[in-house]
Interface confidence: low
């Protein structure tokens, strides 16, 4: 999906009002120094591409993020503010329902959500690039 035509300010508002708090809740009890940020993004569409990938694509050691509160709110925000996004996700959602993995918070998931926090912060700060 090409995130170029999303309403970035609306997505930013959704992040600031709820998604950011849900990410913090998920990470509660984890030291901020525990994970290094290894994933970056260069502009807002790129950030959303990386955010979508880390949030919804199962990875080795972490298959359960898509059912978390922050993930559901991320999906809702993208569906509302990115034209045509929900249509591209129908097949992926059906495939995910068939898997229905057990919900476990692994260290790998915590690391992945730490990366997500960094990507969201970067999404919110393109202003640094403006002189």
């Amino acid at each position: 999906y090409d995130f170029t035509n999303c309403d970035f300010e609306k997505i930013k508002a959704a992040y600031l009002s709820t998604i950011s708090k849900d990410l913090i809740t998920y990470m509660s009890g984890t030291k901020s120094t525990e994970f290094n940020n290894t994933v970056s993004c260069s502009n807002r569409p790129h950030c959303l591409t990386e955010i979508q990938s880390l949030t919804f694509n199962p990875t080795a050691g972490c298959a359960s993020l898509a059912k978390e509160m922050f993930a559901m709110k991320t999906k809702a925000a993208l569906a509302i503010w990115c034209p045509g996004y929900s249509e591209t996700q129908i097949n992926a959602t059906q495939a995910m329902k068939k898997r229905r993995k057990r919900k476990v918070t692994t260290n790998k998931c915590l690391e992945q959500v730490s990366q997500l926090q960094g990507l969201w912060r970067r999404f919110n700060r393109p202003l640094l690039k403006q002189q």
Partner: antibody, heavy 117, light 111 residues
Framework: QVQLRESGPGLVAPSQSLSITCTVS????????VNWVRQPPGKGLEWLGV???????NYHSAFISRLSITKDNSKSQVFLKLNSLQTDDTATYYC???????????WGAGTTVTVSS | DIVLTQSPASLAVSLGQRATISCKAS??????????MNWYQQKPGQSPKLLIY???NLESGIPARFSGSGSGTDFTLNIHPVEEEDAATYYC?????????FGSGTKLEIK
């Protein structure tokens, strides 16, 4: 392993231009920004400018009229060009990788530039 | 531009004691709950090395005797217990807005 290596001319005559190349490895210039910082002998660190992952730049206002930072992503190289050099531009010039939070997590060893006739 | 005022300019600390370095910013470097203040160590003839990022986060591979604290405009770097190898110049740097700026440096001598 992330590495940056500066290569410069060493000696530049006053009023001439300085060109330094920063060659990076272990990361992609399309994912992270590269900053230039200089340090005159016996003095502190001075930020010159940055070229971001998407190719946009920011320059320190004190250098904006004579500084240019460009890059070649395919060659993993970043270029600094500083025009109209004076003796007080004598310094060690460093390139440094920017992190996702914009601090400088890896630095090159630096290249010493002397401006003298 | 954000001006960073570091103090003291130099200090001498006995081996095993605590070294405290202050950095005051001319305006807040906080953004969305993060304090974008960083600390670097530079030894003679070497390039700077990142110690602490975003006010209090210890860079990977840096000994736990280094710690950072503060928010808004007032920040502190603590080294305890000080070791011989900590003799160096320490710089604070803000990454909250461009132009990025550094403090003038604090030279630490071990007695």
């Amino acid at each position: 392993q992330v590495q940056l290596r500066e290569s410069g001319p060493g000696l530049v005559a006053p009023s001439q231009s300085l060109s330094i190349t920063c060659t990076v490895s272990g990361f992609s210039l399309t994912s992270y920004g590269v900053n230039w910082v200089r340090q005159p002998p016996g003095k502190g660190l001075e930020w010159l400018g940055v070229i971001w992952d998407d190719g946009t730049t920011n320059y320190h206002s004190a250098f904006i009229s004579r500084l240019s930072i460009t890059k070649d992503n395919s060659k993993s190289q970043v270029f600094l060009k500083l025009n109209s050099l004076q003796t007080d531009d004598t310094a060690t010039y460093y390139c440094a990788k920017g992190s996702i939070y914009w601090y400088f997590d890896v630095w090159g060893a630096g290249t010493t530039v002397t401006v003298s006739s | 531009d954000i001006v960073l005022t570091q103090s003291p300019a130099s200090l001498a600390v006995s081996l095993g004691q605590r070294a405290t370095i202050s950095c005051k910013a001319s305006q807040s470097v906080d953004y969305e709950g993060d304090s974008h203040m960083n600390w670097y160590q530079q030894k003679p003839g070497q390039s700077p090395k990142l110690l602490i990022y975003v006010a209090s986060n210890l860079e990977s591979g840096i000994p736990a005797r280094f710690s950072g604290s503060g928010s808004g405009t007032d920040f502190t770097l603590n080294i305890h217990p000080v070791e011989e190898e900590d003799a160096a110049t320490y710089y604070c740097q803000q990454s909250n807005e461009v132009p990025f700026t550094f403090g003038s440096g604090t030279k630490l001598e071990i007695k």
